[in-house]
Amino acid sequence: VPPYGSENQTCRDQEKEYYEPRHRICCSRCPPGTYVSAKCSRSRDTVCATCAENSYNEHWNYLTICQLCRPCDPVMGLEEIAPCTSKRKTQCRCQPGMFCAAWALECTHCELLSDCPPGTEAELKDEVGKGNNHCVPCKAGHFQNTSSPSARCQPHTRCEDQGLVEAAPGTAQSDTTCRNPSESLPPEMSGTMLM
């Protein structure tokens, strides 16, 4: 049990103890949510105190202060997903429609997602906000007719399901054009019932 002497400058539990070189001893670190209020000596172990409101320490530490909680910066495109606690900093993420453009241990700056052009959609990612859109083509039988960061490819209209006949097949950028079976001229509107 700390404190105890250490000649080789290493401690038995690296996570929860640290080497104090002045006394050549191993002392306890303070648990998450606390800080060192009194340093250890040969006869007394570290004394810890709870972090004050609006401050935190995330790890086992031998810091003499707690870190100040910082809000998520909306100017940098960030929003809060979990508040700061004594044991954890404020959890931030990119606002909807944005992705992380600068990373330094955590996201520091978000930017607007790129539009995907007609005929494409954003490839689905494991984690929202992780990277910019990578636009991929619509699968066969699907279309997407806008420039948008979030539009999804939709299946082509099946004219027969609406009792209509196909006037022009769909492409990646346009829906199937349907017409009434009795119509001879192709209509101007796509994927809709025209009388």
Epitope: S114, D115, C116, P117, G119, T120, E123, L124, H134, C135, V136, P137, C138, K139, A140, S147, A168, P169, T171, A172, Q173
Partner: antibody
């Protein structure tokens, strides 16, 4: 210099399987979509399959859908085409190709611009 | 699916001639049209992308034009090394289809 080198072709019986490989060099493999194109003896080019840079999105010609699987291993800079339930009509030279992305394009979409580099091809013969 | 039709299927010409090959799409494909050259026993070579943009390293005697459904590949002055098969390909809508090819041979 950008290079693509296919391997894995050969003679296989109908119903059999084969895995083609395409080793890529000279470019950032993980940044580009990749394509397989085939050419039956004395015939024209036929688009077979396409894979996105991440490998998460894949596309197939109707003639191979459900039988062929395209994949990629970024750590090995290699593109694959797993071919199952092979038929006589799958006999062809198979080319892998790198999709083109022109420098002057504003909207980053590699898929509209075809391919710019081709491998030398590997021959697959399906016959009993 | 979008069908690509090339014409002519074969063409005889002489060195120095101006040659035009056409490609027609069954639907509007904007300018998402590419041209490839292939010599017998060799892999295809990319010539033109986006209907009219030359791939790097391709001689300027090759040019492409068109938009929508009708496209052309023009070789302004045929060289001996230009005798080959030429293919167009649309990259507008999956599946990305090729034309049937045009065989350009020496007259």
């Amino acid at each position: 210099e950008v290079q693509l080198l296919e391997s894995g072709g050969g003679l296989v019986q109908p119903g059999g399987s084969l895995r083609l490989s395409c080793a890529a060099a000279g470019f950032t493999f993980s940044s580009y979509p990749m394509t397989w194109v085939r050419q039956a003896p004395g015939k024209g080019l036929e688009w077979v399959s396409l894979i996105s840079p991440s490998g998460a999105t894949t596309y197939y010609a109707d003639s191979v859908k459900g039988r062929f699987t395209i994949s990629r291993d970024t750590s090995k800079n290699t593109l694959y085409l797993q071919m199952n339930s092979l038929r006589a009509e799958d006999t062809a030279v198979y080319y892998c190709a790198k999709n083109h992305y022109p420098d002057d394009v504003i909207i980053k979409n590699y898929y509209f611009y075809g391919v710019d580099v081709w491998g030398q091809g590997t021959t697959v013969t399906v016959s009993s | 699916d979008i069908q690509m039709t090339q014409s002519p299927s074969s063409l005889s010409a002489s060195v120095g001639d101006r040659v035009t090959i056409t490609c027609r799409a069954s639907q509007d494909i904007s300018n998402y049209l590419n041209w490839y050259q292939q010599k017998p026993g060799k892999a295809p070579k990319s010539l033109i992308y986006a209907a009219s943009s030359l791939q790097s390293g391709v001689p300027s005697r090759f040019s492409g034009s068109g938009s929508g459904t009708d496209f052309t590949l023009t070789i302004s002055s045929l060289q001996p090394e230009d005798f080959a098969n030429y293919y167009c390909q649309q990259t507008h809508t999956i599946p990305y289809s090729f034309g049937q090819g045009t065989n350009l041979e020496i007259k």
